[in-house]
């Protein structure tokens, strides 16, 4: 996330963090249900674990973190990497959460979002895009939903219903290692963070992020089948 | 079949230009990155240029910066590299290769280049 | 700029043998190193990416290890067709920067 601020701790219960090998953060993730999480298809990997309840970056151990295994990995059918469209898959846990303060499931929003609605994406990212300025804690920042005209004029050709662009303030936006994160407007994920231009956080090049209000129905029957 | 195809190479004197080309096929070019790579005679790998799916980031090594410059036509699956005032040093065989890592998807993994073309020789000499 | 330093330049072994060559880079790129085979008058070859990941149909005799400075790339039983240049590269910052290679010959 550049130029976001430090999230509250405990404020994202659902904020979820992809690692390979021990620590090494690669893509975030939004607990959605006591064993099943969201996250961008392009995040997927074999290996890969969990963490939830965490706020620092670093591997230090918080009293409300817990670790997690993926044990089934379920990329949105339509996704083709490295497109953009259709970019969200599905994780089950290896076991259902403990539900705490720290850790807790997001509703996900049944309506699109309209233009101007403001909202809260968080990651721990770069702060940058040079690309080893990391945060020391869980960073949030707000963004506002775009018109879809908007959207699509700022990355002509490459905007679909699946998609929706957020933030477009300057020096305001997610950022390399947020993919797979939580949009969340009024209380609802509206969102995961997909991609954007590079460096992030260009003037008219707004961070564009996964449609959930399109797959809503695809989320619960994949969930109920597995 | 993957497949990258470069052509443009030749001889020319120093200060000259040329320009090279990269047909690709078999893929979606316009959802990858790419990148122009050169090997000078009897020497290692040096990276050139890069150019994004959609062309917004663009980078150069100090080597050639101000002289080069990349470019790509989504519509007719090409990449290209202009050369201008061409050194001695530059001469090399030129390679086009396509980059894994999509700078656009926001996760934090980088891969590499997957798919080389067979090179294209370029000879700066007087 | 980041340097990424081989060695060594060059080793001769035996087909069976096992060989590892080194590679370090002047400043931390976490696990963002790929590994490359060049055959003489042919293109390179991605091996290995994010240092220890064996791109597909690559022999699984080839194996990568490594992070932040200091990488290993293995070649646990050294095949004929084996004996080639690799070249290690970082990729996560702009200019990528390669290796100076290191050649495999027949002893």
């Known amino acids: 996330i550049v130029n976001g601020s430090d999230c509250q701790k405990d404020a994202q219960p659902w904020q979820g963090a992809l690692l390979l090998g021990p620590n090494k953060l690669y893509c975030g993730a939004v607990l959605i249900s006591p064993q099943w999480l969201l996250t961008a298809a392009h995040c997927r990997k074999p290996v890969f674990r969990i963490r939830l309840g965490h706020h620092s970056m670093s591997p230090v151990y918080e009293s409300g973190q817990q670790m997690f295994q993926g044990i089934k990995s379920i990329p949105h059918p339509g996704y083709s990497h490295p497109g953009h469209s259709n970019d969200l898959m599905l994780i089950k846990m290896n076991r259902k959460i403990r539900d705490s303060h720290s850790v807790k499931p997001v509703e996900i929003a049944c309506d699109c979002a309209t233009e101007g609605t403001r909202c809260m994406v968080s990651g721990w990212g770069t702060t940058s895009s040079s690309h080893n300025n990391f945060p020391k804690v869980l960073q949030c920042l707000n963004i506002t939903v775009l018109s879809e005209e908007r959207c699509k004029n700022s990355y002509p050709g490459q905007i679909d219903k699946t998609m929706f662009c957020a933030g477009d303030e300057e020096g305001r936006d997610s950022c390399q290692g947020d993919s797979g994160g939580p949009v969340v407007c009024n209380g609802k994920l509206q969102g995961l963070v997909s991609w954007g231009d590079f460096p992030c956080a260009q003037r008219n090049r707004p961070g564009v992020y996964t449609n959930l209000c399109e797959f809503v129905k695809w989320i619960k029957d994949t969930m109920n089948s597995n | 079949e993957v497949q990258l195809v470069e052509s443009g190479g030749g001889l020319v004197q120093p200060g000259g230009s040329l320009r090279l080309s990269c047909a690709a096929s078999?893929?979606?070019?316009?959802?990858?990155?790419m990148n122009w790579v050169r090997q000078a005679p009897g020497k290692g790998l040096e990276w050139v240029s890069y150019?994004?799916?959609?062309?917004?980031?663009?980078d150069y090594a100090d080597s050639v910066k101000g002289r080069f410059t990349i470019s790509r036509d989504n519509a007719k699956n090409s990449l290209y590299l202009q050369m201008n005032s061409l050194r001695a040093e530059d001469t090399a065989v030129y390679y086009c290769?396509?980059?894994?890592?999509?700078?656009?998807?926001?996760?934090?993994?980088?891969?590499?280049?997957?798919?080389w073309g067979q090179g294209t020789t370029v000879t700066v000499s007087s | 700029d980041i340097q990424m330093t081989q060695s060594p330049s060059s080793v001769s072994a035996s087909v069976g043998d096992r060989v590892t060559i080194t590679c370090r880079a002047s400043?931390?790129?976490?696990?963002?190193l790929a590994w490359y085979q060049q055959k003489p008058g042919k293109a390179p070859k991605l091996l290995i990416y994010?240092?220890?990941s064996l791109q597909s149909g690559v022999p699984s005799r080839f194996s990568g290890s490594g992070s932040g400075t200091d990488f290993t790339l293995t070649i646990s039983s050294l095949q004929p067709e084996d004996f080639a240049t690799y070249y290690c590269?970082?990729?996560?910052?702009?200019?990528?920067?390669f290796g100076g290679g290191t050649k495999v010959e027949i002893k």
């Open positions: 290769a396509r980059d894994l890592t999509s700078m656009q998807s926001r996760d934090y993994y980088y891969y590499g280049m997957d798919v």
């Open positions: 078999g893929f979606t070019f316009n959802d990858y990155s």
């Open positions: 150019i994004s799916s959609s062309s917004s980031y663009i």
């Open positions: 400043q931390g790129i976490s696990s963002w």
């Open positions: 994010a240092a220890s």
């Open positions: 590269q970082q990729v996560p910052i702009f200019p990528y920067t």
